[in-house]
């Protein structure tokens, strides 16, 4: 049967009975081998039944004395089997054995849960020699026990290559409950049930769990650890904790905040990073995410022109990197821009609207209805056209660029002319006779040169020929026009 000592028990006497050889209690030890600095124990547990033989490992010495009497089996004397004490208290326990003097170099080692205890443990071995035997007492002390000191302690002694092992001494350190799992902060959907877990251990067991929500007890009758609380849903933020109770008292977990997921706040600080004729690069600072990660954002763009039809263009983008290039915009136009972002709950309101403008661009279309004819009397080529639609000028017209290419007998030369924005005609001198002249015209703004019109060709004959009909831009889909006289 296990003997059990509680911390309230009186210390056992150091030597409850005489060791073989009539060891006196006032006998001073011949040798004391401290393994660590001295310690005054609050409790001392010593052998209680020194006379009873050990039931475990026993070494039977092969050597006999001078009188040839066989030596008795060597065994550790029985001691207290179970020590229960509170955390931070001190404890001392020991093993004792009587060894015939014929054995030299006997050492005792301490083991806990199958591992040898080495290093700076408070272990002291004392030797009490007598005529025939030496009483050896190995003491082990712990000044302030912790849970990690819980376990089964044994002594081992090697003698004649035989190992003698003591009965185990079970140390049970009791204290307040210790949490192995505490509730964790969560972000939850409104009115949706969720679980919280709390687990605590002793000893002593059992450990009972109370749940607390916003400082009110959820369960008046505790549950045994571990406990899972199903919270039926929340409409507003709440703080939860759990209380773990055992016979030593109670421990309270950390309080955790459970937040209710909501739609995000609108983005702030929408700003223009860069503008071109047809695009605007914007950035924004996201608002509060409503305890739920942003999924994506929506950029809303509407023309600021009061005469516009007020339609809104919507561009969807990922929530990161809080940057978006709005494309397909008109040049030299004013826009109102707002940003909204969404999480799993829904869309935020739109950010404050900001005004942004695109810059001038090069015209997007060429001049229309280009016609070319030869004025032989003045030796000029007359060119006429219609200016591109205002909407597609993408800026203020500053003029036109005329390209005329002269091809004759394997020779080709291109000339460029710039003309002002007023008017829609030009006259260029004939450069080569008996040649083909190819004319193209592009509109020009401060934003650049637009596309050239389709080429219009006219044949310039040798001197002395008559006036000829004009050549003009073909209808779409026709081959390059050429006027052959």
């Amino acid at each position: 049967a296990i003997t059990e000592a509680r911390e309230e028990a009186k210390p056992y006497p150091l030597f409850p009975g005489p060791f073989p050889g009539s060891l006196q209690t006032d006998h001073t030890p011949l040798l004391s081998l401290p393994h660590a600095s001295g310690y005054q124990p609050a409790l001392m547990f010593s052998p209680t039944q020194p006379g009873r033989p050990h039931t475990g490992n026993v070494a039977i010495p092969q050597v006999t004395s001078v009188e040839s009497k066989p030596l008795p089996p060597l065994a550790f004397k029985h001691t207290v089997g179970h020590i229960i004490l509170s955390e931070h208290k001190g404890v001392k326990f020991n093993c004792s054995i009587s060894v015939p003097n014929i054995y030299q170099d006997t050492t005792i080692s301490w083991w806990k849960d199958g591992k040898e205890l080495l290093g700076a443990h408070h272990a002291i071995t004392q030797f009490y020699p007598d005529d025939e035997v030496t009483a050896i007492i190995a003491s082990f002390s712990i000044t302030s026990v912790q849970r990690s000191d819980n376990g089964s302690y044994i002594c081992k002694m090697k003698i004649n290559n035989e190992e003698i092992v003591s009965d185990p001494i079970y140390i049970e350190v009791q204290g307040l409950p210790h949490f192995t799992k505490q509730p964790e902060s969560m972000n939850v959907t409104r009115n949706t049930a969720f679980n919280l877990t709390c687990q605590a251990v002793g000893p002593p067991e059992p450990v009972n769990i109370f749940w607390v929500q916003n400082s009110s007890r959820v369960n008046e009758q505790p549950e045994k650890s571990p406990s899972v609380l199903t919270v039926p849903g929340l409409t507003e933020m709440a703080v939860f904790s759990c209380e773990a109770h055992n016979d030593k008292g109670l421990t309270v977990s950390k309080g955790v905040q459970i937040n209710i997921k909501a739609i995000p706040s609108p983005p702030t600080e929408v700003s223009i990073r860069n503008s071109t004729a047809h695009s605007i690069l914007i950035s924004w600072v996201p608002g509060f995410d409503g305890y739920s990660p942003f999924r994506n954002c929506s950029i809303q763009v509407k023309e600021a022109d009061p005469l516009s039809n007020g339609s809104v263009m919507i561009f969807n983008t990922s929530a990161l990197p809080h940057l978006y290039q709005i494309k397909q915009l008109q040049a030299l136009a004013n826009y109102s821009i707002g940003v909204s972002c969404m999480n799993e709950i829904g869309w935020s309101a739109v950010s404050p609207w900001i005004l942004a403008s695109t810059t001038e661009g090069a015209p997007s279309v060429a001049p229309l209805n280009v016609t070319v004819f030869l004025n032989e009397s003045s030796d000029n080529v007359d060119i006429r056209w219609m200016k591109p639609p205002t909407k597609q000028q993408d800026g203020e017209l500053v003029g036109y660029r005329i390209s005329h290419v002269w091809q004759s007998a394997g020779i080709s030369k291109e000339l460029l002319e710039e003309v002002g924005q007023n008017g829609s005609r030009a006259r260029i001198s004939v450069q080569v006779h008996n040649a083909t002249c190819t004319v193209r015209i592009a509109a020009v703004t401060r934003g650049g040169v637009g596309p050239f019109s389709d080429p219009v060709k006219i044949f310039i004959p040798a001197h002395g020929w008559v006036d000829y009909a004009p050549s003009s831009t073909p209808a779409p889909g026709n081959a390059d026009p050429v006027l052959i006289i």
């Epitope: 009110s216 959820v218 008046e220 009758q221 505790p222 549950e223 039926p232 849903g233 409409t235």
Partner: antibody, heavy 118, light 106 residues
Framework: QIQLVQSGPELKKPGETVKISCKAS????????MNWVKQAPGKGLKWMGW????????TYAEEFKGRFAFSLETSASTAYLQINNLKNEDTATYFC???????????WGAGTTVTVSS | QIVLSQSPAILSASPGEKVTMTCRAS?????MHWYQQKPGSSPKPWIY???NLASGVPARFSGSGSGTSYSLTISRVEAEDAATYYC?????????FGGGTKLEIK
């Protein structure tokens, strides 16, 4: 299935004592607290208190301290309500109700009617 | 202790009508439970923790609210809904019940 079966109606004289029972079945009796609720004729519900079925510790609402006693017979999964020194105003139906988290009474007995009349 | 006031005390409705009864608390509560009681019977758990229907409760019932104001709504009243409905708070001890709303069907 889970149920709470209460003892039958009682007719008592003022000053007498009554003890009514509530037998639980279909669940582990000691895992849930047991509550007692009073309903006077034509009136609403009034929580009287509860008993911890694990420890046997009773808790009484202020109005029901003194003459009222909750007790258990755990081996029989039964809770008891005893009213001493009965008064006319104790005439009511008394319900036992199983306690779930958040003071939610998820299972109710059918009620025991106690009539106090001289 | 928290006092719960239910209104109206008596509610009369025709089948198919939508009805709402309210429960006001003298101070803020976290959850409100609701029970249905018919004459001669024990109360039945009806709505748990503000908005969760108890087992077997028809989906035409719903509960909502927060703080000091809670309500039970029946989207289309049926004859079998005639009963007294009690609210009961969880937030602070002791648990308290409202005085009840009696629903009559015309």
């Amino acid at each position: 299935q889970i149920q709470l079966v209460q003892s039958g109606p009682e007719l008592k004289k003022p000053g007498e004592t009554v003890k009514i029972s509530c037998k639980a079945s279909g669940y582990t009796f000691t895992n849930y607290g047991m509550n007692w609720v009073k309903q006077a004729p034509g009136k609403g519900l009034k929580w009287m208190g509860w008993i911890n079925t694990n420890t046997g510790e009773p808790t009484y609402a202020e109005e029901f301290k003194g003459r009222f006693a909750f007790s258990l017979e755990t081996s029989a999964s039964t809770a008891y309500l005893q009213i001493n020194n009965l008064k006319n105003e104790d005439t009511a139906t008394y319900f036992c109700a199983r306690y779930y988290n958040y003071w939610y009474f998820d299972v109710w007995g059918a009620g025991t009617t106690v009539t106090v009349s001289s | 202790q928290i006092v719960l006031s239910q209104s109206p005390a008596i509610l009369s409705a025709s089948p198919g009508e939508k009805v709402t009864m309210t429960c006001r608390a003298s101070s803020s509560v976290s959850y409100m439970h609701w029970y249905q009681q018919k004459p001669g019977s024990s109360p039945k758990p009806w709505i748990y923790a503000t908005s969760n229907l108890a087992s077997g409760v028809p989906a035409r019932f719903s509960g909502s609210g927060s703080g000091t104001s809670y309500s039970l709504t029946i989207s289309r009243v049926e004859a079998e809904d005639a009963a007294t409905y009690y609210c009961q708070q969880w937030s602070s001890k002791p648990p308290t019940f409202g005085g009840g709303t009696k629903l009559e069907i015309k």
